[in-house]
Interface confidence: medium
């Protein structure tokens, strides 16, 4: 049967819903706009969020053939042209990207705090400190360890964006994920076996995936002129 | 420890919708898939669907998709499933079963004790 | 929507190894299938054995593998004990249909 790994899946869900579960760690809802639908250039539609409890999201309309609803799910733009059919992401891959994520933000717990402090987030900054840091992040190349730290950076960006109270911030943020796991991410995944070998590597006999040697990096923090978030893409992207 | 908490049996008309319970406790609800399994006296098993709790994604086996409706509570750790329009094949053990994962492998690992539903006019 | 087929009943000794097999209808079953194997003892006690093919669950014990054979998954019990004797039921991930099972394959320890 097809490697539907290597054949490809909706790295938009993927990002979706690790927000989605980032955001529920710390009791936020997340009623996503209308992310990757909408045009090249357009803001999408702001996301909603709730702390309370009982909040339930709205699922969209199933799609057959698999009846599934979700809050994740956004139609294609219309008259999109139609790519290669993508396969619904086995829950196994949410499940080891949640894992390898909480692993990599409790291995680093002091850092990430630090990091979120030094944010400064504002709607006119994301964007430039989204995109420097994750530049910075693989600028010397990709592994499965920098993608597992892009996830957990954009997660950070989003819990700092509603603890700032800017959660339009969060739709937009899942787009960055999105289009940069698209334009730069996707080949590199597809050529190393696809989210399938990540499942795969991330096991018993493959840990730690985050061999890096951060101590090393310690003593960029003093050279650190051009800022705090350059600083801490810098700090991931040797890892 | 991981415990999934189902209601009793329960005994309805064909037709009238039977709703069942799952509390969970042990775990972080929001971390773990949940899953529901039919067993009908004598046969196998057969997947129904699963839930993701962060954020109420549902997807249902095709076959149940007009059937079954797999709902949360995340105030009470409580997942549900509704069965409409029941008719006599709907008679069966109903599981609900918390999906695990270590180190990229998925398991079925954690059951319910089952509660029987029973359509009887 | 997919079949899958499993042994409807099997019998071995103590100290024998027996393999257990889960075949799908829609062609090899591989790694991406995610094959998932399951034990229910009576009154309706399940344990989840092994996942993603060939990784055994915490606290299962050592006897117990998973594999590819040809185009089908495998649990193999090397040193079958009687308390092994129970229903073994088989589950695969398709990318269309998500999970299913196989109809389980009765074991039985003499």
């Known amino acids: 049967m097809a490697h539907a790994g290597r054949t490809g899946y909706d790295n938009r869900e993927i990002v979706m819903k690790y927000i989605h579960y980032k955001l529920s760690q710390r009791g936020y809802e997340w009623d996503a706009g209308d992310v990757g639908a909408a045009p090249p250039g357009a803001a999408p539609a702001p996301g909603i969020f709730s702390s309370q409890p009982g909040h339930t999201p709205h699922p969209a309309a199933s799609r057959d053939p698999v009846a599934r609803t979700s809050p994740l799910q956004t139609p294609a733009a219309p008259g999109a042209a139609a790519g290669p059919a993508l396969s619904p992401v086995p829950p196994v891959v949410h499940l080891t990207l949640r894992q390898a994520g909480d692993d990599f933000s409790r291995r680093y717990r002091r850092d990430f705090a630090e990091m979120s402090s030094q944010l400064h987030l504002t709607p006119f900054t994301a964007r430039g400190r989204f995109a420097t840091v994750v530049e910075e992040l693989f600028r010397d190349g990709v592994n499965w360890g920098r993608i597992v730290a892009f996830f957990e950076f954009g997660g950070v960006m989003c819990v700092e964006s509603v603890n700032r109270e800017m959660s339009p911030l969060v739709d937009n943020i899942a787009l960055w994920m999105t289009e940069y796991l698209n334009r730069h991410l996707h080949t590199w995944i597809q050529d190393n076996g696809g989210w399938d070998a990540f499942v795969e590597l991330y096991g018993p006999s493959m840990r730690p995936l985050f061999d890096f040697s951060w101590l090393s990096l310690k003593t960029l923090l003093s050279l650190a002129l051009v800022g705090a978030c350059i600083t801490l893409g810098a700090y991931l992207g040797h890892k | 420890q991981v415990q999934l908490q189902q209601s009793g049996p329960q005994l309805v008309r064909p037709g009238a919708s039977v709703k069942i319970s799952c509390k969970a406790s042990?775990?972080?609800?929001?971390?773990?898939?949940m899953h529901w399994v039919k067993q009908r006296p004598g046969q196998g098993l057969e997947w129904i669907g699963m839930?993701?709790?962060?954020?109420?994604?549902?997807r249902l086996n095709q076959k149940f998709k007009d059937k079954a409706t797999l709902t949360v509570d995340k105030s009470s750790s409580t997942a549900y499933m509704q069965l409409s329009r029941p008719t006599f094949e709907d008679s069966a053990v109903y599981y609900c079963?918390?999906?695990?994962?270590?180190?990229?492998?998925?398991?079925?690992?954690?059951w319910g004790q089952g509660t029987l539903v029973t359509v009887s006019a | 929507q997919a079949v899958v087929t499993q042994e409807s009943a099997l019998t071995t000794s103590p100290g024998e190894t027996i393999t257990l097999t889960c075949r799908s209808s829609?062609?090899?079953?591989?790694?991406?299938?995610?094959a998932t194997w399951v034990q229910e003892k009576p009154d309706h006690l399940f344990t989840g054995l092994m996942g993603?093919?060939?990784y055994r669950a915490p606290g299962v014990p050592a006897r117990f593998s998973g594999s590819l054979i040809g185009d089908k998954a495998a649990l193999t019990i090397t040193g079958a004990q009687t308390e092994d004797e129970a229903m073994y039921f088989c589950?695969?991930?398709?990318?269309?249909?998500?999970?299913?099972f196989g109809g389980g394959t009765k074991l039985t320890v003499l």
């Open positions: 839930i993701d709790p962060s954020d109420s994604e549902t």
């Open positions: 993603g093919t060939t």
């Open positions: 589950a695969l991930w398709f990318s269309n249909h998500f999970w299913v």
């Open positions: 829609t062609g090899a079953v591989t790694t991406s299938n995610y």
């Open positions: 079963e918390r999906g695990d994962y270590y180190y990229g492998s998925s398991y079925f690992a954690y």
């Open positions: 042990g775990y972080s609800f929001t971390s773990y898939w």
